[in-house]
Interface confidence: medium
């Protein structure tokens, strides 16, 4: 099995984790995709997923998590807004491909959320107030109930993540594999 690596992000409460998961375009464009958290000793837990089949550039919101699948570019954008300390954990993106095991994307992301903003109070909110407005047409999707542990047989692509500060609500905890996007405050 290939050893999974983690990439660590250190963010403040109230900021946004904005990550992108790259996938093989032709193979997975319309596949259902999910954002998962992995806690020590537990199976991966799915926090949010796209519709089935996944729709192009159509935001799906589950609490404080927003997923957007960009088929033309082969990437899933994941945002966790208004981060809380309890959101700290290990995350990952996966592609559902029943009846096979979910296909994991990229290196895992270790998210560390600490209390309080750095710098001037409120500066992050101000600087990103116009950044992560959640579209009014977001959809909630039903996710498959199963999450099974998997043996990684190939090195996953690398990931990308981003940070910002919007105002929305999400319920999360730990997660495993994801890709990161840059952070804008």
């Amino acid at each position: 099995a290939t050893k999974l690596t983690e990439e660590k992000y250190e963010l403040k409460e109230g900021q946004t984790l904005d990550v992108k998961c790259d996938y093989t375009l032709e193979k997975f464009a319309s596949s259902q995709k999910a954002w998962q958290i992995i806690r020590d000793g537990e199976m991966p837990k799915t926090l949010a997923c796209t519709e089935r089949p996944s729709k192009n550039s159509h935001p799906v919101q589950v609490g404080r998590i927003i997923l957007e699948d960009y088929h033309d570019h082969g990437l899933l954008r994941v945002r966790m807004v208004n981060l809380q300390v309890e959101d700290s954990g290990l995350y990952q993106c996966v592609i559902y491909q029943p009846p096979k095991e979910p296909h994991m994307l990229f290196d895992r992301i270790r998210l560390v959320v600490t209390k309080g903003f750095s710098g001037t109070p409120g500066s992050n909110e101000n600087s990103t107030q116009n950044v992560y407005k959640i579209p009014p047409t977001t959809t909630k999707a039903l996710c498959p109930l199963y999450t099974s542990p998997r043996t990684v047989t190939q090195a996953p692509p690398k990931s990308t993540a981003d940070v910002s500060t919007p105002d929305s609500e999400i319920n999360l905890t730990n997660v495993t594999d994801i890709i990161r996007v840059p952070v804008f405050n």
Partner: antibody, heavy 125, light 107 residues
Framework: QVQLVQSGAEVKRPGSSVKVSCKAS????????ISWVRQAPGQGLEWMGG????????NYAQQFQDRVTITADESTRTAYMELNSLKSEDTAVYYC??????????????????WGQGTTVTVSS | DIQMTQSPTSLSASVGDRVTITCRAS??????LAWYQHKPGKAPKSLIY???SLQSGVPSRFSGSGSGTDFTLTISSLQPEDFATYYC?????????FGQGTKLEIK
């Protein structure tokens, strides 16, 4: 080989606006961060803001939040930075720079790896 | 915002010298730090990314280390073309912030 080509030098009056363009040739444009960085005479580098063209949502440094607008046009592979209410202190060289995108662990995993040649903006009455 | 503090702000050295520049972040940034070289009239050049990875085409005399809040750029044996201003930049979170720069001059 990705290249970023910026528009030419500008001379502006205080209170006016300037719009600098940054055209990408070669490689992928849409899913990279295009950042804008400036350097005033005798000063250091200052990150103004950036945009991922595909997502279209700009991010700004706090000190420029009220005066700068960063946009991108995917069809022409061009990013723009418009700075309003110009002051003499805005006299600087303005650079666009690309942060890495797909297949990396972070949109800017490689830092700002490709830079434009710079655009000199002079604000003077 | 995350503040980046470089030291020293200026440094005089001779060809062949080993030079170290440090950069400190006001909060943890994991390894999301880059180093740039900037010469007058030219665009900045990326040297190091992810704190310690050498950008393609950059001579191996440049190296970076550190994680969390403390980072170092080392030039093992100064060459004439290395005299320039060096900047660190964090990209753990927006706004991406630069250090104030370290000007490396010929002694």
């Amino acid at each position: 080989q990705v290249q970023l080509v910026q528009s030419g030098a500008e001379v502006k009056r205080p209170g006016s606006s300037v719009k600098v363009s940054c055209k990408a040739s070669g490689g992928t444009f849409s899913i990279y961060v295009i950042s804008w960085v400036r350097q005033a005479p005798g000063q250091g580098l200052e990150w103004m803001g950036g945009i991922i063209p595909l997502f279209g949502t700009p991010n700004y440094a706090q000190q420029f939040q009220d005066r700068v607008t960063i946009t991108a046009d995917e069809s022409t592979r061009t990013a723009y930075m418009e700075l309003n209410s110009l002051k003499s202190e805005d006299t600087a060289v303005y650079y666009c720079a690309r942060g890495h995108g797909p297949g990396s662990s972070h949109y800017s995993y490689y830092g700002l790896d490709v830079w434009g040649q710079g655009t000199t903006v002079t604000v003077s009455s | 915002d995350i503040q980046m503090t470089q030291s020293p702000t200026s440094l005089s050295a001779s060809v062949g010298d080993r030079v170290t520049i440090t950069c400190r972040a006001s909060q943890g940034i994991s390894s999301w730090l880059a180093w740039y070289q900037h010469k007058p009239g030219k665009a900045p050049k990326s040297l190091i990314y992810a704190a310690s990875s050498l950008q393609s085409g950059v001579p191996s005399r440049f190296s970076g280390s550190g994680s969390g809040t403390d980072f170092t750029l080392t030039i093992s044996s100064l060459q004439p073309e290395d005299f320039a201003t060096y900047y660190c930049q964090q990209y753990n979170s927006y706004p991406y912030t630069f250090g104030q720069g370290t000007k490396l001059e010929i002694k």
